[in-house]
Interface confidence: low
């Protein structure tokens, strides 16, 4: 059985294809190749005569075809027009003809694709975006990549138009990409340059920094406002509801207690039309917003009951503070034997009794802050009672 085989079957444009012949009969006069599925003299490519070992170009010869003595046909520099069927007719010595038909497919070397978009500046949670991979070519597979990865499964991603169009439903700020499309055919593949989306969003609720609430008079107040937004938000400041300025930063030098109040940052995105505000309370006070931990000291920590007295002192470097004392979680003084002096910095117990043994600590505080000392332990001992008979033991 006479057969033909295309090597290769899928050919890149500009390359060559060899139509191989198998089971060629013996005792031949010659053979001819034709373009198409049947023998048609007008579509003869080349004929070969065994006796003269000479090939004769036919009407369909383009100058790119070479016939070999084994009847194989080489077609060089193929074009897409060469795609299709080729028929070999063998003329045997008994004048009986045999035919075999083969085919091959020529694919173009694919160009570098590009991505077009129906909306390059979509609004978050509102707009959809359709990407289209260009050009549209036949017999081409279209693939998409997001962040160099194949498409994730997502209800917001839709492929259509033979996978040539990728639609993002309800874009988010995380959908910036990059996006790439790849086109493939059996002989080549090519990927587009990456495309990124400029997703318009925000502003989110602004953040005012630093987070400090308390400031001392004479300090400089410097507040900065930031809200995630694309395009970047436009900012304005209000103090106690009164507009101050349209800047991202608010600076007030040498503040006084009169600068206390509510500070509002207003963020606006002119594209989305959205606004967000954040209010921060600022307190300007001489009081320390952070009271340091006080130190507690005892004149002695082990005393004799009903005999000794003890002085506990609470030390602090902070000014404008008050001091209070605690014993076993109870506020002091709790008896007439306990006295506070020197602005409550000293707690005196005179005399000390058994029930005074335990843990003491002090707390310093102002209207906006407080801090307590580490505890101190007071031990109360009693001397051994004298012998009732006055005699020494033994």
């Amino acid at each position: 059985q006479l057969t033909t085989e295309s090597m290769p079957f899928n050919v890149a444009e500009g390359k060559e294809v060899l139509l191989l012949v198998h089971n060629l009969p013996q005792q031949l006069f010659g053979y001819s190749w034709y373009k198409g599925e049947r023998v048609d003299g007008n579509r003869q490519i080349v004929g070969y005569a065994i006796g003269t070992q000479q090939a004769t170009p036919g009407p369909a010869n383009s100058g790119r075809e070479t016939i070999y003595p084994n009847a194989s046909l080489l077609i060089q520099n193929v074009t897409q027009n060469d795609t299709g069927f080729y028929t070999l007719q063998v003329i045997k010595s008994d004048l009986v003809n045999e035919e075999a038909t083969g085919q091959f497919h020529v694919y173009p070397e694919l160009p570098k694709p590009s991505i077009s978009s129906n909306n390059s500046n979509p609004v978050e949670d509102k707009d959809a975006v359709a990407f289209t991979c260009e050009p549209e070519t036949q017999d081409t597979t279209y693939l998409w990549w997001i962040n160099n990865q194949s498409l994730p499964v997502s209800p917001r991603l839709q492929l259509s138009n033979g996978n040539r169009t990728l639609t993002l439903l309800s874009v988010t700020r995380n959908d910036t990409g990059p996006y790439e499309c790849e086109i493939q055919n059996p002989v080549s593949a090519n990927r587009s340059d990456p495309v990124t989306l400029n997703v318009t969003y925000g502003p989110d609720t602004p953040t005012i920094s630093p987070s400090d609430t308390y400031y001392r008079p004479g300090a400089n107040l410097s507040l900065s406002c930031y809200a995630a937004s694309n395009p970047p938000a436009q900012y304005s400041w209000l103090i106690n509801g009164t507009f101050q300025q349209s800047t991202q930063e608010l600076f007030i030098p040498n503040i006084t207690v009169n600068n206390s109040g509510s500070y509002t940052c207003h963020a606006n995105n002119s594209v989305t039309g959205c606004n967000r505000t954040t209010v921060k309370t600022i307190i300007v006070t001489e009081l320390s917003p952070v009271v340091a931990k006080p130190q507690i000291k005892a004149s002695k920590t082990t005393v004799t009951g009903d005999k000794d007295s003890v002085n506990l002192t609470c030390s602090t470097n902070d000014t404008g503070i008050s001091i209070r004392w605690f014993f076993k979680n109870q506020s002091l003084p709790s008896s007439e034997r306990m006295k506070l002096s020197q602005g409550n910095t000293t707690l005196s117990i005179n005399p000390v009794k058994r029930e005074d043994a335990g843990t003491y600590w002090c707390e310093v505080f102002n209207p906006i802050s407080k801090n307590q000392s580490d505890p101190i332990m007071l031990n109360v001992n009693y001397n051994a009672l004298p012998q009732e008979n006055g005699l020494s033991p033994g």
């Epitope: 500009g14 390359k15 070999y68 080489l74 074009t79 027009n81």
Partner: antibody, heavy 118, light 113 residues
Framework: QVQLVQSGSELRTPGASVKVSCKAS????????LSWVRQAPGQGLEWMGW????????TYAQGFTGRFVFSLDTSVSTAYLQISSLKAEDTAVYYC???????????WGQGTLVTVSS | DIVMTQSPDSLAVSLGERATINCKSS????????????LAWYQQKPGQPPKLLIY???TRESGVPDRFSGSGSGTDFTLTISCLQAEDVAVYYC?????????FGQGTKVEIK
């Protein structure tokens, strides 16, 4: 790696013949055509023609028919250029060059200087 | 036959400067079926065989530095060396492989100024 190694320099008298060889290695010899290019002293490049290494079929450029013969010995992956009836104007460096898949000559032999002098 | 004409015949360029060589073909070498220009550029240094630099008029051969670039279409083509190096001193040839006989330009000698 692909290499085309040509035979050494030749000195001939007018009327004599010379045969230059070009041995290929590093690829399938019969898959790529081989061209011959001439470069006369101080002159440019002149394409002489090529030989189909699959069929052995040579193609000669105008001016290189008759005295010039391209041939092959595929068993040793070698192409030959034979010039007969040498003339003084045949003095030149002769290059073999592989016809790349796209057509241009992607690999060249080192060249063979043929000097024709009485 | 297609005649290839290069200009200039020689040029001297300072190191680091741009060198531009032109090549004109007497017939169109653009193949409309694949939109390829069947034109190549070669570099030949003294005592060496030519080396393929560019094919399809603008595609750099593997391993060729990117300071070499080709452009043009149809009948007018250009080889540009964007930043001339000392090792670029050579004769440069264009060649059409659109139709037989394949033909070369006469060559352009590039020297250091």
């Amino acid at each position: 790696q692909v290499q085309l190694v040509q035979s050494g320099s030749e000195l001939r008298t007018p009327g004599a013949s010379v045969k230059v060889s070009c041995k290929a290695s590093g690829y399938t010899f019969t898959s790529y055509g081989l061209s011959w290019v001439r470069q006369a002293p101080g002159q440019g490049l002149e394409w002489m023609g090529w030989i189909n290494t699959n069929t052995g079929n040579p193609t000669y450029a105008q001016g290189f028919t008759g005295r010039f013969v391209f041939s092959l010995d595929t068993s040793v992956s070698t192409a030959y250029l034979q010039i007969s009836s040498l003339k003084a104007e045949d003095t030149a460096v002769y290059y073999c060059a592989r016809k790349g898949i796209w057509g241009p000559f992607d690999y060249w032999g080192q060249g063979t200087l043929v000097t024709v002098s009485s | 036959d297609i005649v290839m004409t290069q200009s200039p015949d020689s040029l001297a360029v300072s190191l680091g400067e741009r060198a531009t060589i032109n090549c004109k073909s007497s017939q169109n070498v653009l193949y409309s079926s694949n939109n390829k220009n069947y034109l190549a550029w070669y570099q030949q240094k003294p005592g060496q065989p030519p080396k393929l630099l560019i094919y399809w008029a603008s595609t750099r051969e593997s391993g060729v530095p990117d300071r070499f670039s080709g452009s043009g279409s149809g009948t007018d083509f250009t080889l540009t060396i964007s930043c001339l190096q000392a090792e670029d001193v050579a004769v440069y040839y264009c060649q059409q492989y659109f139709s037989s006989p394949w033909t070369f330009g006469q060559g352009t000698k590039v020297e250091i100024k």
